[in-house]
């Protein structure tokens, strides 16, 4: 396949991803099935410079990450280990707290107003932001 | 490689008490919640208790409450579970376990409780 | 406390046969459920969590379904290392509850 060499329209680019800030908000699986409809997924934050240019670009609104543990371990959607990766997390958190009285515990992880991490009830309707990386061999069959 | 290891176990008389540890590597401890669940012999699993990452919240079975305590060190990535007052349907094999959908155990340690 | 019921207690079926086990809870606990096999002896092992999502390293013969209050475990051709006691758990809300379990034996 061609690989995109600039970001779309209405995308962010940085040091080699592109980024689209959503506006409006989703359930952590829509959100996901969202940047995955726009070759993408969900951000996954691989260090403190890249924590700090999604702060920057979200403000103090929760907004959905692209990690996860719903199925057992803490996971990033695009495979990037989560032991030895980078993480924010808010003091006391991750939390699984069950006294939300939704069902189950605290699945999905977001930016909070102060850009670190919780983990919260993956259906609440969060903002969300897609990455996608630069170079990266596009979906589209190469013209013959 | 997730490893729990767990400890602590052995006879002890009705009314005795006992600390089961659970030493945990291979994870990153403070992310995770961890449960405490028991079978009696010939019996089927029983939860007994958990509690979050950062150890703020404890839950508890209700043939428990009172009488065990859940808590945790994260400095040292280890679990435990102090057991007061105890009964002899309390004699199980203990296994922690992790996570909130119990995804990974250890491979239990037998208290029996006994005159 | 939600109460999980499993069927049947027990069967007996060959190698190659397909193999399905019924979880039902006393209330709606959404895909907050689990499975483990137990052999003999051993520690249990997670087999599936969020009622259809098969753990890291357990072969795909196994599947679950459901959601609410019905679940079920299949093997699609069962084998030697998969005669077993199965269990499920939900963990919708504390205290977890199990079922009573499910002995897979040799027929």
């Known amino acids: 396949g061609s690989e995109r060499t600039c970001c779309p329209v209405n995308w962010v680019e940085h040091e080699r991803s592109c980024y689209w800030f959503s506006r409006s908000g989703k359930a952590w699986a829509d959100a996901d099935n969202y940047c995955r409809l726009e070759d993408a997924h969900l951000v996954v934050v691989t260090s403190w410079e890249e924590q700090k240019f999604v702060q920057h670009h979200i403000g103090p609104v929760n907004t959905w990450m692209g990690l996860h543990d719903q199925n057992g371990p803490w996971k990033w959607v695009d495979g990037t280990d989560y032991e030895t990766g980078f993480k924010n997390w808010r003091p006391e958190q991750p939390d699984d707290w069950y006294g939300h009285g939704l069902g189950g515990g605290e699945d999905c992880a977001h930016f909070t107003d102060d850009g670190r991490w919780n983990d919260d009830v993956c259906q609440r309707p969060y903002r969300w932001v897609c990455e996608t990386e630069l170079d990266k061999a596009s979906q589209e069959p190469p013209l013959l | 490689e997730v490893q729990l290891l767990e400890s602590g176990g052995g006879l002890v008389q009705p009314g005795g008490s006992l600390r089961l540890s659970c030493a945990a590597s291979?994870?990153?401890?403070?992310?995770?919640?961890m449960s405490w669940v028991r079978q009696a012999p010939g019996k089927g699993l029983e939860w007994v208790s958990a509690i979050s990452g950062s150890g703020g919240y404890t839950y508890y079975a209700d043939s428990v409450k009172g009488r065990f305590t859940i808590s945790r060190d994260n400095s040292e990535n280890t679990l435990y579970l102090q057991m007061s007052s105890l009964r002899a349907e309390d004699t199980a094999v203990y296994y922690c376990?992790?996570?909130?959908?119990?995804?990974?155990w250890g491979q239990g340690t037998l208290v029996t409780v006994s005159s | 406390d939600i109460q999980m019921t499993q069927s049947p207690s027990s069967l007996s079926a060959s190698v190659g046969d397909r193999v399905t086990i019924t979880c039902r809870a006393s209330?709606?606990?959404?895909?907050?459920l689990a499975w483990f096999q137990q052999k003999p002896g051993k520690a249990p092992k997670s087999l599936i969590s969020?009622?259809?999502s098969l753990q890291s390293g357990v072969p795909s013969k196994f599947s679950g379904s459901g959601s609410g209050t019905d679940f079920t475990l299949t093997i699609s051709s069962l084998q030697p290392e998969d005669f077993a006691t199965y269990y499920c758990q939900q963990y919708n809300s504390y205290p977890f509850t199990f079922g009573p379990g499910t002995k897979v034996d040799i027929k």
């Open positions: 291979g994870f990153t401890f403070s992310s995770y919640a």
């Open positions: 969020a009622a259809s």
């Open positions: 376990a992790k996570g909130g959908s119990l995804f990974y």
């Open positions: 209330q709606g606990i959404s895909n907050y």
